[in-house]
């Protein structure tokens, strides 16, 4: 709970409201510190900041609520009710509440631990969201090589909008026991699976860190094996020298795969969202948006009117594909009973033709024996290559023997012919190797994603068990952490491989790699933060968690050190790789010039049970430096691009921005005139927790 501020003196708890779409809103009972359901029994998630403020005022009529602000971290709330249901379900949901601010704004009193610094930033020319100022605080701390420990808003200038931020930065070492307690928040994650994602929603539905689950779906009790069996990993972190991908592809211990309702419902929701028709809505703005076209299996552009519509409505093609692309292709795969690892693999364009030796491997979908299949294909390829080379060398010898009596020029021509033939065979082999490696890597990635998804599901299920079993939670967390570690390791190795064979391409994909690593980092910390929402469990397994994370930290350091010092990477058989002597230059794995530093690759922290791990950016697309991208729409209902007040929609025939030469009359149009009144709406972004389960 937030410490009550001056405005709430005498109250046991701070007034807050929490929303979870499809359930009745909750508000904090300030007398007893418990969450109560909506008193009217009718109100569910509200999609504007104004609405949230108004709702705060309704549920706390005796308090003078003047503003709202997102809480810095999520909370677990039980007993969410459905409209018209007498009994409320006890299944908890993790949501980020909104704090209802009382009276004149008073900034939060932040604790400044020893060796930490209190800082603040005010900009009278800026009026921005909690997300923006959180990002400012985090980046300021980063610039000083410190971690953001806590933060609070300053100088309100609108509903949930501020002109400044106060924050505490702590040295990286100190932060080992208190990592960005503020950062568990799903910053960018508009809960787009809530009601219609209208343009004026300003992303203000509660940010859900867990994922929506359908009440109708029966709760599936996981048939758990004995705890000791849970721990039987066969999965320790030491690298097998032979094959960097080997560990990433070893056979999974078969975990009982009774899918949790959590994942099921998220996937259902995503499928539902992505299969909706593109809907312009009632307003007349022409906002360029993207929707997932099920028939085409890809995202397509459409014009959105600015209000109404549905959730199949994305700001960019990348977001659209991130959300729907994989989810829809997976759902198609599922319906045809294909395992996830069998995603079609993009083959490199370099391979002129698919050689027989590799045919079988390339045409057989990946499975849990991927590594063995890969090894076999490698061996077949090398054997075939050796055989063809011997054949050519034999032909060459024979030709040279016959050319003994020929003129010098003809001898030269024979030599040249065979040199070219050898070179062409080498090139062909190199292409085939490249194709093989890329196919292997793509399959490994699919499997890693699959495993991470499963591990995350099992971990969340373990956390949600009533009562939760700490040992089981720890074992599931351990598996999940390993899965993330492997993803990270795979990403780095993939990048290094590309850097070795095609430095130009490596430069192009560098930012994607950086983003992917950051996504892993954020998702990892987000997932860890869930543990701290179940304090009883967190306390009991704290030491093991610390140890686990320390182990992983050390391992990460090693991997990175190797990546930096070793310009080469072995795929288990160097004959597989083309000669790369010329590329053995200074290693530039990732730039360290402010664009990216090794710290960005360190997701492992040890922290106390009272803290929550960091999660700040939550980007699922390549990182955009702008703190709150696409600040295109306003917090005012129906205003911004449509410039129409909702009350007046009936009067306004068409937005003036698009009616120039039409015969329409527009009356009493009220604009959002000041830029500071423009809110931020990220459109349909799904948070990393969901990303962990659905997208990645």
């Amino acid at each position: 709970l937030e410490v009550p501020t001056d405005g709430n003196a005498g109250l046991l708890a701070e007034p807050q409201i929490a929303m979870f779409c499809g359930r009745l809103n909750m508000h904090m009972n300030v007398q007893n510190g418990k969450w109560d359901s909506d008193p009217s029994g009718t109100k569910t998630c509200i999609d504007t900041k104004e609405g949230i403020l108004q709702y705060c005022q309704e549920v706390y009529p005796e308090l003078q609520i003047t503003n709202v602000v997102e809480a810095n971290q999520p909370v677990t709330i039980q007993n969410w009710c459905k409209r018209g249901r007498k009994q409320c379900k006890t299944h908890p949901h993790f949501v980020i509440p909104y704090r209802c601010l009382v009276g004149e704004f008073v900034s939060d009193a932040l604790l400044v631990p020893d060796k930490c610094k209190f800082l603040h930033q005010e900009r009278m020319d800026v009026c921005e969201t909690h997300l923006h100022w959180h990002t400012v605080a985090k980046e300021t701390c980063s610039e000083k090589s410190t971690n953001l420990h806590d933060y609070g808003m300053l100088l309100p200038c609108g509903i949930d909008k501020f002109r400044g931020v106060e924050f505490v930065c702590c040295p990286l070492a100190e932060e080992s026991d208190n990592v960005d307690s503020a950062d568990a928040e799903e910053d960018d994650s508009d809960v787009w699976w809530g009601g219609a994602d209208t343009d004026y929603a300003d992303g203000s539905e509660d940010k859900v860190v867990e994922v929506a689950e359908e009440e109708e779906v029966a709760e599936v009790e996981e048939e758990e094996a004995d705890d000791d069996e849970d721990d039987e990993d066969g999965d320790e972190v030491e690298e097998e020298a032979e094959e960097p991908y080997e560990e990433a592809t070893e056979r999974t211990t078969s975990i009982a795969t009774t899918t949790t309702t959590t994942t099921e419902s998220v996937e259902e929701v995503v499928r539902e969202v992505c299969s909706e028709q593109a809907e312009t809505g009632p307003c007349r703005a022409m906002i360029s948006r993207w929707y997932f076209d099920v028939t085409e299996g890809k995202c397509a552009p459409f014009f959105y009117g600015g209000c109404g519509g549905n959730r199949n409505n994305f700001d960019t093609e990348e977001y659209c594909m991130a959300v729907c692309g994989s989810a829809m292709s997976q759902s198609l795969l599922k319906t045809t009973q294909e395992p996830l690892a069998r995603d079609p693999v993009k083959l490199p364009t370099t391979a002129a033709s698919t050689p027989d030796a590799v045919d079988k491997y390339l045409e057989t979908p990946g499975d849990e024996n991927e590594h063995a299949h890969f090894q076999k294909a490698k061996e077949r390829l090398e054997a075939k290559h050796r055989e063809r080379m011997s054949q050519v060398m034999r032909e060459w010898e024979e030709a040279e023997r016959q050319a003994k009596n020929l003129p010098k020029a003809d001898k030269k021509a024979v030599i040249q012919h065979f040199q070219e033939k050898v070179e062409s065979l080498e090139q062909e082999a190199a292409n085939e190797r490249q194709q093989l490696v890329e196919t292997h890597m793509a399959r490994v990635e699919a499997m890693l994603n699959d495993r991470r998804r499963l591990a995350l599901e099992n971990y969340i299920t373990a956390l949600q068990a009533v009562p939760p079993r700490p040992r089981h939670v720890f074992n599931m967390l351990k598996k999940y952490v390993r899965a993330e570690q492997k993803d990270r390791q795979h990403t780095l190795k993939h990048f290094e491989h590309v850097r070795m064979v095609d430095p130009k391409k490596a430069a192009q994909i560098r930012s994607q790699v950086m983003t992917h690593l950051r996504v892993i980092y954020e998702r990892m910390n987000q997932s860890l933060s869930l543990l701290y929402n179940v304090p009883a469990v967190a306390e009991e397994i704290q030491d093991e968690v610390d140890e686990l994370l320390q182990k992983e930290q050390n391992y990460s350091d090693d991997v990175l050190a190797n990546m930096i010092s070793e310009p080469r990477i072995s795929y288990g058989n160097d004959a597989l790789m083309p000669s790369l002597t010329e590329t053995k230059t200074t290693v530039e794995l990732l730039p360290v010039n402010g664009e990216f530093s090794l710290d960005d690759l360190q997701p492992w922290h040890s922290f106390g049970a009272d803290s929550v791990p960091a999660n700040t950016e939550n980007e699922v697309e390549p990182v955009d430096a702008r703190p709150a991208a696409d600040r295109g729409l306003t917090t005012r209902p129906g205003s911004g691009l449509t410039n129409i007040k909702t009350e007046e929609i009936s009067e306004v025939k068409m937005d003036a921005e698009f009616r120039h030469d039409s015969g329409y009359e527009v009356h009493h149009q009220k604009l959002v005139f000041f830029a500071e009144d423009v809110g931020s709406n990220k459109g349909a972004i799904i948070g990393l927790m969901v990303g962990g389960v659905v997208i990645a």
């Epitope: 104004e50 403020l53 003047t66 503003n67 704004f105 009278m124 020319d125 800026v126 009026c127 100088l155 309100p156 200038c157 609108g158 509903i159 909008k161 501020f162 002109r163 702008r626 709150a628 696409d630 600040r631 295109g632 729409l633 005012r636 209902p637 205003s639 007040k645 009350e647 921005e657 009493h668 149009q669 009220k670 604009l671 959002v672 005139f673 000041f674 830029a675 500071e676 009144d677 423009v678 931020s680």
Partner: antibody, heavy 112, light 112 residues
Framework: EVKLVESGGGLVQPGGSLKLSCAAS????????MSWVRQTPEKRLELVAE????????YYPDTVKGRFTISRDNAKNTLYLQMSSLKSEDTAMYYC?????WGQGTTLTVSS | DVVMTQTPLSLPVSLGDQASISCRSS???????????FHWFLQKPGQSPKLLIY???NRFSGVPDRFSGSGSGTDFTLKISRVEAEDLGVYFC?????????FGGGTKLEIK
């Protein structure tokens, strides 16, 4: 119809005080940042004060900081400007504005 | 503060002529959401300023189509294709991208 109606202007002596009011109608007052803008006898327009929609934040240029206070009562759809320590250079036509809509103005004359 | 510089100060025209007024801002008025918060107001004699063009080129309610706005970043232009008697008055450019809201010095459109 969007309407902004100012009142409270008049003649005051230097050092004196005055409170201007602006009654708003025809739109959801509590949704919009509101401003007081003045027009000097030379016809120059200058922002005097600005207040966010909830009243949680205000802005004043240095010329009036500490002397003028902007406030609003969203329940009454009214904007206020409390002026004190008035100077002759504050003489102007004062407009209440929501950016796209302006009132008809009220005149303040500061003179001894 | 963002300084808005308007030219010319005075523009004598004949009815039916085309008129053009320029305005330059001291910094970019492009907001991070991609919109440019630059506007034109017209103040007719004895009246308060009225919004004419908002966000560079959008005509406000009831504004005839002989008025058009253009420009980007820091340079903007207002054009009146055929000046009519009711168009006479002082034209102000304005920006609301940055706090505080600021205005140009005005251009007086008058009959030759």
């Amino acid at each position: 119809e969007v309407k902004l109606v100012e009142s409270g202007g008049g003649l005051v002596q230097p050092g004196g005080s005055l409170k201007l009011s602006c009654a708003a109608s025809g739109f959801t007052f509590s949704d919009y940042t509101m401003s007081w803008v003045r027009q000097t006898p030379e016809k120059r327009l200058e922002l005097v004060a600005e207040i966010s929609n909830t009243g949680g934040s205000t802005y004043y240029p240095d010329t009036v900081k500490g002397r003028f206070t902007i406030s609003r009562d969203n329940a009454k759809n009214t904007l206020y400007l409390q002026m004190s320590s008035l100077k002759s250079e504050d003489t102007a036509m004062y407009y209440c504005a929501s950016g796209d809509y302006w009132g008809q103005g009220t005149t303040l004359t500061v003179s001894s | 503060d963002v300084v808005m510089t308007q030219t010319p100060l005075s523009l004598p025209v004949s009815l039916g002529d085309q008129a053009s007024i320029s305005c330059r801002s001291s910094q970019s008025l492009v907001h991070s959401n991609g919109n440019t918060f630059f506007h034109w107001f017209l103040q007719k004699p004895g009246q308060s300023p009225k919004l004419l063009i908002y966000k560079v080129s959008n005509r406000f309610s009831g504004v005839p189509d002989r008025f058009s706005g253009s420009g980007s970043g820091t340079d903007f232009t207002l054009k009146i294709s055929r000046v009519e008697a009711e168009d006479l008055g002082v034209y102000f450019c304005s920006q609301s991208a940055h706090v505080p809201w600021t205005f140009g010095g005005g251009t007086k459109l008058e009959i030759k």
